[in-house]
């Protein structure tokens, strides 16, 4: 019987922010409740001279009025006692985009090909997650090697999120576009 309490989930041991920096393409995602990036999601992680990690991300968002915009998002990460668990503050470059604070866990990565990210926004009384999101990232926009695909599926099962992900298309929709020149 799988333990689905969030406190039992394993994360990447000895996570290295510097090795994680660079471009990651989101290949699959499990959505939370509400507004969220839809597709064409590309994130760029970096670490400054003080060791703080930050990220910018671009992706297509469908607003409540059914407008599609390419959103530019920014996030800063505060370290915790676990090197793979961060407190993330995020906001959209445009004022109408979402902002907030989430946990941001790096569940697993090999730094060179794949990464699995997880965030639980709301806990149930029994310690399981009531509202979560998760991304599968690849260094290559064409996808993941078969062995990486398998370990990713295993991690999805360990997060109690098997079969809850959907693939993310990368069709160039946001290449050279942003919300500033679409509205």
């Amino acid at each position: 019987e799988r333990d689905c309490r969030v406190s039992s989930f394993r994360v990447k041991e000895n996570f290295d922010k510097a090795r994680f920096s660079g471009t990651w393409y989101a290949m699959a995602k499990k959505d939370p409740e509400g507004l969220f990036l839809q597709d064409n999601i590309v994130a760029e992680f970096s670490v400054d001279e003080t060791g703080q990690m930050s990220a910018t991300a671009k992706g297509r968002v469908r607003l409540l009025n059914n407008w599609d915009v390419c959103a530019d998002m920014v996030g800063t990460f505060t370290d915790t006692e676990d090197p793979a668990k961060f407190k993330m503050k995020y906001w959209g470059v445009a004022s109408f985009l979402q902002k907030g604070n989430d946990d941001h866990w790096i569940v697993d990565t090999d730094y060179d090909t794949y990464a699995v990210q997880y965030s639980c926004r709301l806990l149930n009384l029994d310690g399981t997650c009531a509202d979560s999101y998760s991304f599968v990232f690849s260094r290559d926009p064409n996808g993941l090697p078969p062995e990486a695909q398998k370990i990713v599926r295993q991690r999805q099962e360990e997060l109690c999120l098997a079969r809850q992900y959907r693939l993310i298309v990368h069709n160039g929709y946001c290449d050279g576009r942003s919300e500033r020149n679409l509205l």
Epitope: R139, D140, P145
Partner: antibody, heavy 121, light 111 residues
Amino acid sequence: QVQLQQPGAELVRPGTSVKLSCKASGYRFTDYWMNWVKQRPDQGLEWIGRIDGYDSETHYTQYFRDKAMLTVDKSSSTAYMQLSSLTSEDSAVYYCARSGAVEGRYSMDYWGQGTSVTVSS
Amino acid sequence: DIVLTQSPASLAVSLGQRATVSCRASESVHSYGHSFMHWYRQKPGQPPKLLIYRASNLESGIPVRFTGSGSGTDFTLTINPVEADDVATYYCQQSNEDPRTFGGGTKLEIK
């Protein structure tokens, strides 16, 4: 530290079977594949097949599909290879070797010391 | 199956000099942004030991005298400078597709 423990030697009769073991320690067994590699005296390395420690998915090279059967026991973190219908051609050293995506190598990063199988009447 | 052809089959190099081993694949072993070619060293009576993974990445604990290069179908292992401890047989191996395959090996001796 990662270790793959194999028995040193097996002496078996022609026409019989032998089951080789490879006990893993020092890592999460279900995160990796176990490969098996054959080496005849003064010869090169020949890949037999691999098995996923998580769900027992297997891949074999064509010749060994009828010769070798790979299994795992997750509870003891042990991989097994059964070789059947043994002939003198099966006399060799058999290595187990770990591989996987977790650390990004996609190569066989740890090897057992090998089991020397001698087929003789 | 992907056939890996190593050359030369054997070579003799003076201490302190450079040794170069070549491995050619019958088809590309490059996919998803990486070349899935690896190099191993085997000394007599011992199991193989990983030296280089994914064409050019030095395995932890391996001296920087060992370098791997190449992509697609043509790969090279270079040892510079060669030391007495390097006497061994060197193998390339691909993991781009099943069945995994090894090259025939290159035996390095000291001149």
